[in-house]
Protein backbone atom coordinates (compact mmCIF):
# COMPACT_ATOMS: atom_id res chain seq x y z
CA UNK A 1 0.00 0.00 0.00
CA UNK A 2 2.88 2.35 0.90
CA UNK A 3 4.64 1.56 -2.40
CA UNK A 4 1.39 2.06 -4.30
CA UNK A 5 0.77 5.53 -2.83
CA UNK A 6 4.39 6.53 -3.52
CA UNK A 7 4.01 5.43 -7.14
CA UNK A 8 0.77 7.38 -7.50
CA UNK A 9 2.49 10.48 -6.08
CA UNK A 10 5.38 10.01 -8.49
CA UNK A 11 3.05 9.68 -11.46
CA UNK A 12 1.16 12.83 -10.56
CA UNK A 13 4.47 14.69 -10.12
CA UNK A 14 5.65 13.39 -13.49
CA UNK A 15 2.42 14.58 -15.10
CA UNK A 16 2.92 17.99 -13.50
CA UNK A 17 6.43 18.29 -14.93
CA UNK A 18 5.43 16.88 -18.31
CA UNK A 19 3.83 20.17 -19.33
CA UNK A 20 7.27 21.80 -19.03
CA UNK A 21 9.54 18.91 -20.00
CA UNK A 22 8.11 16.37 -22.48
CA UNK A 23 10.67 13.80 -21.41
CA UNK A 24 12.62 13.26 -18.18
CA UNK A 25 15.58 10.97 -17.56
CA UNK A 26 15.56 9.74 -13.97
CA UNK A 27 17.89 7.71 -11.80
CA UNK A 28 17.21 6.07 -8.45
CA UNK A 29 19.25 7.36 -5.56
CA UNK A 30 19.16 7.73 -1.79
CA UNK A 31 20.10 5.20 0.84
CA UNK A 32 17.11 2.98 0.09
CA UNK A 33 17.14 3.77 -3.65
CA UNK A 34 13.63 5.12 -3.12
CA UNK A 35 14.19 8.64 -4.47
CA UNK A 36 14.34 9.48 -8.15
CA UNK A 37 16.40 12.42 -9.39
CA UNK A 38 15.55 13.60 -12.90
CA UNK A 39 16.82 15.88 -15.62
CA UNK A 40 14.98 16.87 -18.77
CA UNK A 41 16.04 14.80 -21.78
CA UNK A 42 18.65 15.43 -23.27
CA UNK A 43 20.18 17.44 -20.39
CA UNK A 44 23.18 15.94 -18.60
CA UNK A 45 23.45 15.59 -14.83
CA UNK A 46 26.23 16.22 -12.33
CA UNK A 47 25.77 16.15 -8.56
CA UNK A 48 22.49 18.00 -7.86
CA UNK A 49 22.23 19.88 -11.16
CA UNK A 50 21.23 19.42 -14.80
CA UNK A 51 23.06 21.04 -17.72
CA UNK A 52 22.05 21.91 -21.27
CA UNK A 53 24.41 23.10 -23.99
CA UNK A 54 22.71 25.45 -26.41
CA UNK A 55 24.36 25.67 -29.82
CA UNK A 56 22.11 28.57 -30.85
CA UNK A 57 24.21 31.74 -31.22
CA UNK A 58 22.61 34.50 -29.15
CA UNK A 59 23.54 37.55 -27.12
CA UNK A 60 24.13 37.11 -23.38
CA UNK A 61 20.77 38.59 -22.41
CA UNK A 62 18.90 36.47 -24.93
CA UNK A 63 20.83 33.38 -23.81
CA UNK A 64 19.83 34.02 -20.18
CA UNK A 65 16.20 34.55 -21.21
CA UNK A 66 16.35 31.31 -23.20
CA UNK A 67 17.59 29.38 -20.14
CA UNK A 68 14.95 31.09 -18.00
CA UNK A 69 12.13 29.88 -20.27
CA UNK A 70 13.36 26.33 -19.59
CA UNK A 71 13.33 26.90 -15.81
CA UNK A 72 17.09 27.35 -15.69
CA UNK A 73 19.80 30.03 -15.66
CA UNK A 74 23.03 30.47 -17.53
CA UNK A 75 25.52 28.22 -15.78
CA UNK A 76 27.02 29.21 -12.42
CA UNK A 77 30.30 27.34 -11.88
CA UNK A 78 31.10 26.68 -8.24
CA UNK A 79 34.01 24.21 -8.36
CA UNK A 80 36.79 22.96 -10.62
CA UNK A 81 35.11 19.53 -10.61
CA UNK A 82 31.91 21.05 -11.96
CA UNK A 83 33.83 22.91 -14.68
CA UNK A 84 35.69 19.73 -15.64
CA UNK A 85 32.38 17.89 -15.98
CA UNK A 86 30.85 20.63 -18.12
CA UNK A 87 33.82 20.94 -20.47
CA UNK A 88 33.73 17.22 -21.34
CA UNK A 89 30.73 18.06 -23.52
CA UNK A 90 32.00 21.28 -25.10
CA UNK A 91 33.67 21.80 -28.50
CA UNK A 92 37.18 23.18 -28.23
CA UNK A 93 36.72 25.60 -31.12
CA UNK A 94 33.59 27.19 -29.59
CA UNK A 95 32.84 29.67 -26.81
CA UNK A 96 29.90 29.43 -24.42
CA UNK A 97 28.28 32.10 -22.26
CA UNK A 98 28.39 31.64 -18.48
CA UNK A 99 25.95 33.19 -16.02
CA UNK A 100 28.56 35.76 -15.04
CA UNK A 101 28.43 39.44 -15.95
CA UNK A 102 29.66 42.90 -14.98
CA UNK A 103 26.86 45.15 -16.28
CA UNK A 104 28.36 48.45 -15.10
CA UNK A 105 31.88 47.71 -16.33
CA UNK A 106 33.27 48.35 -12.86
CA UNK A 107 34.80 44.86 -12.60
CA UNK A 108 32.11 43.89 -10.08
CA UNK A 109 31.32 40.45 -11.46
CA UNK A 110 28.03 38.86 -10.47
CA UNK A 111 26.43 35.46 -10.97
CA UNK A 112 22.88 35.31 -12.35
CA UNK A 113 21.58 33.34 -9.35
CA UNK A 114 23.11 35.85 -6.88
CA UNK A 115 25.74 33.33 -5.72
CA UNK A 116 28.52 35.53 -4.25
CA UNK A 117 31.41 36.01 -6.70
CA UNK A 118 34.44 34.46 -5.03
CA UNK A 119 37.73 35.54 -6.63
CA UNK A 120 39.39 32.43 -5.16
CA UNK A 121 37.10 30.12 -7.14
CA UNK A 122 37.44 31.58 -10.63
CA UNK A 123 39.02 30.11 -13.72
CA UNK A 124 39.93 33.12 -15.85
CA UNK A 125 42.46 32.59 -18.60
CA UNK A 126 45.77 34.35 -17.99
CA UNK A 127 45.39 38.12 -18.45
CA UNK A 128 41.59 38.00 -18.22
CA UNK A 129 39.30 39.81 -17.60
CA UNK A 130 40.93 42.61 -19.54
CA UNK A 131 38.38 45.19 -20.75
CA UNK A 132 35.66 47.19 -19.00
CA UNK A 133 33.62 47.12 -22.23
CA UNK A 134 33.60 43.31 -22.17
CA UNK A 135 30.97 42.74 -19.52
CA UNK A 136 29.95 39.11 -19.99
CA UNK A 137 31.92 35.91 -19.44
CA UNK A 138 32.42 32.93 -21.73
CA UNK A 139 34.23 29.65 -21.26
CA UNK A 140 36.55 28.64 -24.08
CA UNK A 141 39.61 26.49 -24.79
CA UNK A 142 42.87 28.40 -24.96
CA UNK A 143 46.52 27.57 -24.29
CA UNK A 144 45.66 23.89 -23.83
CA UNK A 145 43.04 24.47 -21.13
CA UNK A 146 39.47 25.54 -20.55
CA UNK A 147 39.03 28.93 -18.89
CA UNK A 148 37.00 32.10 -18.77
CA UNK A 149 37.28 35.23 -20.88
CA UNK A 150 35.37 38.52 -20.77
CA UNK A 151 33.59 39.38 -24.04
CA UNK A 152 31.03 41.83 -25.41
CA UNK A 153 27.56 40.88 -24.21
CA UNK A 154 25.89 41.75 -27.51
CA UNK A 155 28.05 39.40 -29.56
CA UNK A 156 26.18 36.12 -30.22
CA UNK A 157 27.70 33.01 -28.63
CA UNK A 158 26.63 29.49 -27.69
CA UNK A 159 25.65 29.01 -24.05
CA UNK A 160 25.22 26.59 -21.14
CA UNK A 161 22.08 26.41 -18.99
CA UNK A 162 21.95 24.93 -15.49
CA UNK A 163 19.00 23.95 -13.31
CA UNK A 164 18.47 22.02 -10.09
CA UNK A 165 17.59 18.35 -10.49
CA UNK A 166 13.92 17.45 -10.22
CA UNK A 167 13.24 15.06 -7.36
CA UNK A 168 10.17 12.82 -7.51
Amino acid sequence: NFMYSKTVKRLSKLQEYQQYYPSLTCVMEGKDMEDWSCCPTPWTSFQSSCYFISTVMQSWTKSQNNCSVMGADLVVINTKEEQDFITQNLKINSAYFLGLSDPKGWRHWQWVDQTPYNKNVTFWHSGEPNSPDERCAIINFRSEEWGWNDVHCHVPQKSICKMKKIYI
Epitope: S59, G105, S131, C136, H154, P156
Partner: antibody, heavy 121, light 111 residues
Framework: EVQLVESGGGLVKPGGSLRLSCAAS????????MSWVRQAPGKGLEWVAT????????YYPDSVKGRFTISRDNAKNSLYLQMNSLRAEDTAVYYC??????????????WGQGTTVTVSS | DIVLTQSPASLAVSPGQRATITCRAS??????????MHWYQQKPGQPPKLLIY???NLESGVPARFSGSGSGTDFTLTINPVEANDAANYYC?????????FGGGTKVEIK
Protein backbone atom coordinates in the same frame (compact mmCIF):
# COMPACT_ATOMS: atom_id res chain seq x y z
CA GLU B 1 36.75 68.23 -27.59
CA VAL B 2 35.97 64.92 -29.27
CA GLN B 3 36.46 65.05 -33.03
CA LEU B 4 36.05 62.43 -35.74
CA VAL B 5 37.06 63.39 -39.28
CA GLU B 6 36.41 61.03 -42.19
CA SER B 7 38.23 61.09 -45.51
CA GLY B 8 38.81 58.90 -48.56
CA GLY B 9 35.40 59.05 -50.20
CA GLY B 10 34.92 59.67 -53.90
CA LEU B 11 33.58 58.35 -57.18
CA VAL B 12 34.44 54.76 -58.04
CA LYS B 13 33.30 52.29 -60.70
CA PRO B 14 31.36 49.12 -59.78
CA GLY B 15 33.83 46.42 -58.76
CA GLY B 16 36.35 49.02 -57.64
CA SER B 17 37.88 49.68 -54.22
CA LEU B 18 38.18 52.55 -51.76
CA ARG B 19 39.76 52.98 -48.35
CA LEU B 20 38.07 55.31 -45.92
CA SER B 21 39.89 56.81 -42.93
CA CYS B 22 38.67 58.39 -39.74
CA ALA B 23 41.04 60.54 -37.70
CA ALA B 24 40.10 60.71 -34.02
CA SER B 25 41.14 63.34 -31.49
CA UNK B 26 40.11 64.69 -28.09
CA UNK B 27 39.78 61.30 -26.38
CA UNK B 28 41.74 58.13 -25.66
CA UNK B 29 41.04 56.40 -28.97
CA UNK B 30 42.41 53.01 -27.88
CA UNK B 31 39.78 52.75 -25.11
CA UNK B 32 36.72 52.82 -27.37
CA UNK B 33 34.99 50.52 -29.79
CA MET B 34 34.33 52.17 -33.13
CA SER B 35 31.85 51.67 -35.96
CA TRP B 36 31.08 52.75 -39.50
CA VAL B 37 27.46 53.66 -40.26
CA ARG B 38 26.25 54.66 -43.71
CA GLN B 39 23.30 56.54 -45.15
CA ALA B 40 22.20 56.13 -48.76
CA PRO B 41 20.78 59.28 -50.42
CA GLY B 42 17.38 60.07 -48.93
CA LYS B 43 17.42 56.90 -46.79
CA GLY B 44 17.90 55.92 -43.16
CA LEU B 45 20.95 54.84 -41.18
CA GLU B 46 22.57 51.45 -41.76
CA TRP B 47 25.35 50.03 -39.59
CA VAL B 48 28.27 48.72 -41.67
CA ALA B 49 31.08 47.51 -39.38
CA THR B 50 32.27 47.45 -35.77
CA UNK B 51 35.71 46.96 -34.22
CA UNK B 52 36.42 46.56 -30.52
CA UNK B 53 38.84 48.79 -28.62
CA UNK B 54 41.56 46.16 -28.52
CA UNK B 55 41.03 45.03 -32.12
CA UNK B 56 39.98 41.56 -30.93
CA UNK B 57 36.51 41.68 -32.42
CA UNK B 58 35.13 42.80 -35.77
CA TYR B 59 31.57 42.39 -37.01
CA TYR B 60 29.75 43.07 -40.28
CA PRO B 61 26.23 42.76 -41.68
CA ASP B 62 25.70 40.18 -44.44
CA SER B 63 25.38 42.99 -47.00
CA VAL B 64 29.10 43.84 -46.75
CA LYS B 65 30.65 40.68 -45.24
CA GLY B 66 33.62 39.49 -47.29
CA ARG B 67 33.86 42.80 -49.18
CA PHE B 68 34.52 45.36 -46.42
CA THR B 69 37.21 45.22 -43.72
CA ILE B 70 37.32 47.46 -40.67
CA SER B 71 40.65 48.05 -38.95
CA ARG B 72 42.29 50.50 -36.61
CA ASP B 73 45.71 51.87 -35.72
CA ASN B 74 45.62 52.96 -32.09
CA ALA B 75 49.09 54.49 -32.34
CA LYS B 76 47.78 56.81 -35.08
CA ASN B 77 44.33 57.34 -33.53
CA SER B 78 42.85 56.19 -36.81
CA LEU B 79 39.99 53.97 -37.96
CA TYR B 80 39.78 52.52 -41.48
CA LEU B 81 37.27 50.87 -43.77
CA GLN B 82 38.65 48.97 -46.76
CA MET B 83 35.85 48.56 -49.30
CA ASN B 84 36.31 46.11 -52.19
CA SER B 85 34.00 44.85 -54.95
CA LEU B 86 31.90 47.98 -54.62
CA ARG B 87 28.33 47.99 -55.90
CA ALA B 88 25.89 50.75 -56.82
CA GLU B 89 23.96 50.04 -53.59
CA ASP B 90 27.07 50.96 -51.55
CA THR B 91 26.58 54.59 -52.62
CA ALA B 92 26.12 56.54 -49.37
CA VAL B 93 27.55 58.98 -46.88
CA TYR B 94 29.81 56.95 -44.55
CA TYR B 95 30.05 58.07 -40.92
CA CYS B 96 32.58 56.99 -38.35
CA UNK B 97 31.04 56.76 -34.86
CA UNK B 98 32.36 56.17 -31.35
CA UNK B 99 30.69 53.51 -29.20
CA UNK B 100 29.99 54.12 -25.55
CA UNK B 101 29.10 51.02 -23.55
CA UNK B 102 26.07 51.01 -21.30
CA UNK B 103 25.09 47.90 -19.37
CA UNK B 104 24.87 44.98 -21.83
CA UNK B 105 24.93 47.15 -24.98
CA UNK B 106 26.21 50.46 -26.33
CA UNK B 107 25.23 53.59 -28.19
CA UNK B 108 26.98 55.96 -30.59
CA UNK B 109 27.81 59.12 -28.67
CA UNK B 110 29.96 60.95 -31.26
CA TRP B 111 29.77 60.97 -35.05
CA GLY B 112 32.02 62.40 -37.75
CA GLN B 113 30.69 64.69 -40.48
CA GLY B 114 30.79 61.84 -43.01
CA THR B 115 32.48 61.17 -46.34
CA THR B 116 30.55 60.51 -49.57
CA VAL B 117 31.09 57.35 -51.60
CA THR B 118 29.52 57.18 -55.06
CA VAL B 119 29.63 53.94 -57.02
CA SER B 120 28.71 54.53 -60.64
CA SER B 121 29.93 53.63 -64.12
CA ASP C 1 18.08 40.63 -36.61
CA ILE C 2 15.93 42.86 -34.43
CA VAL C 3 13.67 45.01 -36.64
CA LEU C 4 12.72 48.48 -35.41
CA THR C 5 9.55 50.05 -36.81
CA GLN C 6 9.08 53.77 -36.30
CA SER C 7 5.79 55.61 -36.55
CA PRO C 8 4.67 57.89 -37.90
CA ALA C 9 6.98 58.19 -40.91
CA SER C 10 6.44 61.95 -40.77
CA LEU C 11 4.52 64.49 -38.73
CA ALA C 12 3.92 68.22 -38.80
CA VAL C 13 3.72 70.02 -35.46
CA SER C 14 3.12 73.62 -34.51
CA PRO C 15 5.65 75.34 -32.23
CA GLY C 16 4.66 74.91 -28.60
CA GLN C 17 2.84 71.65 -29.28
CA ARG C 18 3.89 68.11 -28.34
CA ALA C 19 5.47 65.68 -30.83
CA THR C 20 5.41 61.96 -30.08
CA ILE C 21 7.39 59.35 -32.03
CA THR C 22 7.15 55.64 -31.34
CA CYS C 23 9.57 52.82 -32.01
CA ARG C 24 8.48 49.19 -31.84
CA ALA C 25 11.06 46.37 -31.72
CA SER C 26 10.40 42.92 -33.16
CA UNK C 27 11.55 41.49 -29.82
CA UNK C 28 12.39 42.82 -26.39
CA UNK C 29 15.42 45.08 -26.06
CA UNK C 30 15.13 45.20 -22.26
CA UNK C 31 16.83 43.08 -19.64
CA UNK C 32 16.30 43.30 -15.88
CA UNK C 33 15.30 46.98 -15.94
CA UNK C 34 17.84 48.10 -18.53
CA UNK C 35 16.34 49.22 -21.84
CA UNK C 36 18.85 49.25 -24.67
CA MET C 37 17.03 51.64 -26.99
CA HIS C 38 18.55 54.98 -28.02
CA TRP C 39 17.36 58.03 -29.98
CA TYR C 40 19.19 60.29 -32.46
CA GLN C 41 18.35 63.54 -34.21
CA GLN C 42 19.65 64.30 -37.70
CA LYS C 43 19.28 67.64 -39.41
CA PRO C 44 19.79 67.99 -43.20
CA GLY C 45 23.45 67.84 -44.20
CA GLN C 46 24.56 66.94 -40.66
CA PRO C 47 25.55 63.72 -38.91
CA PRO C 48 23.20 62.13 -36.37
CA LYS C 49 23.33 63.51 -32.84
CA LEU C 50 22.63 61.43 -29.73
CA LEU C 51 19.57 62.66 -27.80
CA ILE C 52 18.52 59.86 -25.45
CA TYR C 53 20.35 56.70 -24.38
CA UNK C 54 18.96 53.64 -22.62
CA UNK C 55 15.34 54.66 -23.31
CA UNK C 56 15.10 57.62 -20.93
CA ASN C 57 18.52 59.13 -20.20
CA LEU C 58 19.05 62.60 -21.63
CA GLU C 59 22.45 63.07 -23.25
CA SER C 60 24.48 65.94 -21.83
CA GLY C 61 23.66 69.25 -23.53
CA VAL C 62 20.31 68.09 -24.92
CA PRO C 63 17.35 70.31 -23.92
CA ALA C 64 14.93 68.88 -21.36
CA ARG C 65 12.14 69.34 -23.93
CA PHE C 66 13.26 65.95 -25.20
CA SER C 67 12.29 62.89 -23.20
CA GLY C 68 12.17 59.15 -23.75
CA SER C 69 10.21 56.33 -22.21
CA GLY C 70 9.29 52.71 -22.75
CA SER C 71 10.41 49.15 -22.10
CA GLY C 72 10.39 45.75 -23.74
CA THR C 73 9.35 46.33 -27.34
CA ASP C 74 7.61 49.73 -27.22
CA PHE C 75 9.45 53.03 -26.86
CA THR C 76 8.53 56.69 -27.25
CA LEU C 77 10.44 59.91 -27.92
CA THR C 78 8.55 63.04 -26.90
CA ILE C 79 9.40 66.65 -27.76
CA ASN C 80 7.41 69.05 -25.61
CA PRO C 81 7.16 71.89 -26.39
CA VAL C 82 8.38 71.70 -29.98
CA GLU C 83 10.58 74.54 -31.24
CA ALA C 84 11.32 75.61 -34.82
CA ASN C 85 14.84 74.18 -34.79
CA ASP C 86 13.55 70.70 -33.89
CA ALA C 87 12.75 70.12 -37.58
CA ALA C 88 14.83 67.01 -38.34
CA ASN C 89 14.77 63.26 -38.84
CA TYR C 90 14.68 61.16 -35.68
CA TYR C 91 15.97 57.59 -35.44
CA CYS C 92 15.76 54.90 -32.77
CA UNK C 93 18.53 52.28 -32.39
CA UNK C 94 18.85 49.07 -30.36
CA UNK C 95 22.06 47.56 -29.06
CA UNK C 96 21.00 44.58 -26.98
CA UNK C 97 22.17 42.23 -29.71
CA UNK C 98 24.42 42.40 -32.76
CA UNK C 99 23.81 43.60 -35.37
CA UNK C 100 22.85 47.03 -34.03
CA UNK C 101 19.78 48.17 -35.95
CA PHE C 102 18.09 51.50 -36.59
CA GLY C 103 14.47 52.40 -37.14
CA GLY C 104 13.47 53.76 -40.53
CA GLY C 105 13.27 57.32 -39.23
CA THR C 106 10.57 59.89 -38.54
CA LYS C 107 10.61 63.28 -40.25
CA VAL C 108 9.39 66.09 -37.99
CA GLU C 109 8.27 69.25 -39.79
CA ILE C 110 7.29 72.49 -38.10
CA LYS C 111 4.03 74.07 -39.25
Amino acid sequence: EVQLVESGGGLVKPGGSLRLSCAASGFTFSSYGMSWVRQAPGKGLEWVATISSGDSYTYYPDSVKGRFTISRDNAKNSLYLQMNSLRAEDTAVYYCARQLYYSYGYYFDYWGQGTTVTVSS
Amino acid sequence: DIVLTQSPASLAVSPGQRATITCRASESVSFHGTHLMHWYQQKPGQPPKLLIYAASNLESGVPARFSGSGSGTDFTLTINPVEANDAANYYCQQSIEDPPTFGGGTKVEIK
